[in-house]
Interface confidence: medium
């Protein structure tokens, strides 16, 4: 089955620059299928823009200005690229790639979509670092004692743009856990968001990860915030014992035996 | 030109109570097009639900039913037993892939219908209230309450800033909420909640403990061997950007 990944959840540009949006095709050979690009402007219907067929033929929707969009595909990386030239305010939209997933029986074809890339146009000069800054909250003793469950909370602040994806996993598992989140909120020129995960008592002794996808993450990869395993009694954290082998190492919250 | 028009912009549904979305075609016969339904959830993910005839996306067949009313030129999508997972924007779209008439393999979309999910009517439930702290940050966690109306107050004399609470449906079909704030005196912050004409305090849930309750790290986590607790994630979180937590009793 065909699967589409759009690695950029957002792409921030200043006016008149060029935006390049990527779509990675897996589960199907890109040179044996057509890739379609759609646009969803705020408050408007999702609209077909352009497609590139298995033989490289490009088809544009009528009414789309020529020279605005360029579509390409690179079989070696199984990637289709939509290039938007000379970006302007009316290009602000979420752009989706899509393909028809062939099935055996007549009519049994479905069009699957990538997760979308939001094109953001800004005239602001922002701080050098507008990646999400995490703060973690561990379960309260009262909750673990009374409810035999614990809630982890992952707060992300001072990021731009507002497009962010957060999910949770146990340390050695790829299963995405059911979590809950607040709306993304504006704070001055940046944004904040929080997500929380409630786990049963039996899972509290497992390490959990809050995984954050954002355009301005360092090196363009997902940021993982580690929540250490805990026991269902009083937990004492000592900031002096954080584990940081070098400036590139991950966050660690070390459990220590500090009594009152 | 054809146009797909949803019956409603927003449809509130209750958990477990069947709901129907309708989408009418203007300017052409709906029988000349394949109708598709998609759901867009938080984070823009567009998931395929249904396509004529009897084609369902993974996990949708048991809880969704797509149909066409030719006489009324309508596409219909029934959500048989809505759950909180079904919240999102629903789109109808059409194409004529592989069929007679004007061949088009592009999808023509209608505007979305926003489906909001509410818990079904149930006996009133008092919340549990817990406070979580880290540095100047305080979170008030309010769990498993019904109905939705609630006021959450973080009680402090030295407020820096507060944020609007997030109120969501809990997996059990009640509500959960979290309110965040920043305070200079975070250690003394408590949370009080007004719900159903009653006040509930976080202090009501505090557990009395003495030092014998404190737990050593697990045997495998020796504080002198930090490497055992360090993990290389896909990306690095710089420790200077992280508010480390200190809970002492």
């Amino acid at each position: 089955a065909g699967h589409l990944e759009q690695p950029q959840i957002s792409s921030t540009k200043t006016l008149s620059k060029t935006a390049r949006l990527e779509c990675v095709v897996s589960g199907i050979t890109i040179s044996a299928t057509s890739v379609y690009w759609y646009r969803e402007r705020p408050g408007e219907v999702i609209q077909f823009l352009v497609s590139i067929s298995y033989d490289g033929t490009v088809r544009k929707e009528s009414g789309i200005p020529s020279g605005k969009f360029e579509v390409d595909r690179i079989p070696e990386t199984s990637t289709s690229t939509l290039t938007i030239h000379n970006v302007e305010k009316q290009d602000i939209a979420t752009y989706y790639c899509a393909l028809w997933e062939a099935q055996q029986e007549l009519g049994k074809k479905i069009k699957v979509f990538g997760p979308g890339t939001k094109l953001i146009i800004t005239d602001k000069q922002l701080d050098a670092d507008v990646s999400p800054k995490p703060t973690i909250f561990l379960p309260s003793i009262a909750e673990t004692k009374l409810q035999k469950a614990g809630t982890y909370l992952c707060l992300l602040e001072k990021f731009f743009p507002d497009v962010i994806k957060i999910h949770w996993q146990e340390k050695k598992s790829n299963t995405i856990l059911g979590s809950q989140e607040g709306n993304t909120m504006k704070t001055n020129d940046t944004y904040m968001k929080f997500s929380w995960l409630t786990v049963p008592e039996k899972s509290l002794d497992k390490e959990h990860r809050c995984i954050v996808r954002h355009e301005n993450n360092k090196n363009g990869v997902d940021q993982e915030i580690i929540f250490p395993p805990i026991k269902t009694d009083v937990i004492t954290m000592d900031p002096k014992d954080n584990c940081s082998k070098d400036a590139n190492d991950t966050l660690l919250l070390q459990l220590t035996n500090t009594s009152a | 030109a054809i146009e797909l028009v949803p019956e409603h912009q927003t449809v509130p549904v209750s958990i477990g109570v069947p709901a129907t979305l309708r989408c009418s075609m203007k300017g052409e016969a709906i029988g000349n097009y394949y109708i598709n339904w998609y759901r867009k959830t938080q984070g823009n993910t567009m998931t395929f639900i249904y396509r004529e005839k009897d084609i369902y996306g993974p996990g949708f067949k048991d809880n969704f039913q797509g149909d066409i009313d030719i006489a009324k030129n309508l596409a219909v999508l029934k959500i048989l037993a809505p759950s909180e997972r079904d919240e999102g924007s629903y789109y109808c779209a059409c194409d004529t892939l592989g069929m007679g008439g004007e061949y088009t393999d592009k999808l023509i979309f209608g505007k979305g219908t926003r489906v909001t999910v509410e818990p079904r009517s149930q006996p009133h439930t008092k919340p549990s209230v817990f406070v979580m702290k880290n540095g100047t940050n305080v979170a008030c966690l309010v769990k498993e309450f019904y109905p939705k109306d609630i006021r959450i107050n973080l009680v402090s004399s030295k407020k820096i800033t507060e944020f609007d609470p997030a109120i969501v449906i809990s997996p059990s079909g009640k509500y959960n909420a979290v309110k965040l704030g920043k305070y200079e005196d975070s250690n003394s912050v408590t949370c009080s909640v007004q719900h159903d004409n009653k006040t509930v305090h976080s202090t009501d849930f505090e557990v009395k403990t003495d030092s014998t309750d404190h737990v050593k790290p697990k045997e495998t986590e020796n504080t002198k061997q930090p490497s055992k607790s360090c993990h290389k994630p896909k990306a690095i979180v710089h420790t200077e950007k992280v508010n480390m937590m200190s809970l002492t009793v």
């Epitope: 007549l106 009519g107 | 300017g27 016969a29 709906i30 029988g31 000349n32 097009y33 394949y34 004529e52 005839k53 066409i68 030719i70 006489a71 009324k72 030129n73 004529t96 592989g98 069929m99 007679g100 008439g101």
Partner: antibody
Framework: QVQLVQSGPGLVKPSETLSLTCTVS????????WNWIRQPAGKGLEWIGR???????NYNPSLKSRVTMSVDTSKNQFSLKLSSVTAADTAVYYC?????????????WGRGTLVTVSS | QSVLTQPPSVSAAPGQKVTISCSGS????????VSWYQQVPGTAPKLLIY???KRPSGIPDRISGSKSGTSATLGITGLQTGDEADYYC???????????FGGGTKVTVL
């Protein structure tokens, strides 16, 4: 209960125009396609054409030059005109309902009108 | 000559099974849905199968339809004397932009 009631002359002279009407009773014409199908004695079915509520039509290419269909939604009826008839047009003419290219099947039929072309 | 090809006749004893084939091309059966009709002499045709294999309400499950490639098949099990009739297949032809029928098959119960 929806029914299709056919009306029109059973005898038409060669070179003249055959005219038939089909009235939808028990429901509105709705957004269906309304079709005409004929069957010469002892032979198979032949699709003549269809008309949509809006008035758009599709005709069998072999009859296209002689066929005209119309719809009157206010009267809940649709009509067939076949010009320059010959003896080869003698057949039972049926009106029938279908739902479009993806619903090209006839779930409701009129009883049929035998039209004889003879001088 | 019909665009879709059916055998002129098939027969079987009561209680037996008959199958009727209907062959076409990629522009009709190959890319569109097939329907089947029963016509008792002197009456209008009646829809038996639509969308290749679906039965309208009131049609018994001993009537079945299938499609493979550019051919379709109608099956009737537990043959009864009341099944004696002419049977027609039909579909849309994308090249002609027209509806097409088979020439019809007469079913005889021996």
């Amino acid at each position: 209960q929806v029914q299709l009631v056919q009306s029109g002359p059973g005898l038409v002279k060669p070179s003249e125009t055959l005219s038939l009407t089909c009235t939808v009773s028990g429901d509105s014409i709705g957004h269906y396609y309304w079709n005409w199908i004929r069957q010469p004695a002892g032979k198979g079915l032949e699709w003549i054409g269809r008309i949509y509520t809006s008035g758009s039509t599709n005709y069998n290419p072999s009859l296209k030059s002689r066929v005209t269909m119309s719809v009157d939604t206010s009267k809940n009826q649709f009509s067939l005109k076949l010009s320059s008839v010959t003896a080869a047009d003698t057949a039972v003419y049926y009106c029938a309902r279908s739902g479009g290219n993806f619903y090209w099947y006839f779930d409701l039929w009129g009883r049929g009108t035998l039209v004889t072309v003879s001088s | 000559q019909s665009v879709l090809t059916q055998p002129p006749s098939v027969s079987a004893a009561p209680g037996q099974k008959v199958t009727i084939s209907c062959s076409g091309s990629s522009s009709n059966i190959g890319n569109n849905y097939v329907s089947w009709y029963q016509q008792v002499p002197g009456t209008a045709p009646k829809l038996l199968i639509y969308d290749n294999n679906k039965r309208p309400s009131g049609i018994p499950d001993r009537i079945s339809g299938s499609k493979s490639g550019t051919s379709a098949t109608l099956g009737i099990t537990g043959l009864q004397t009341g099944d004696e009739a002419d049977y027609y297949c039909g579909t849309w032809d994308s090249s002609l932009s027209a509806g097409v029928f088979g020439g019809g098959t007469k079913v005889t119960v021996l």
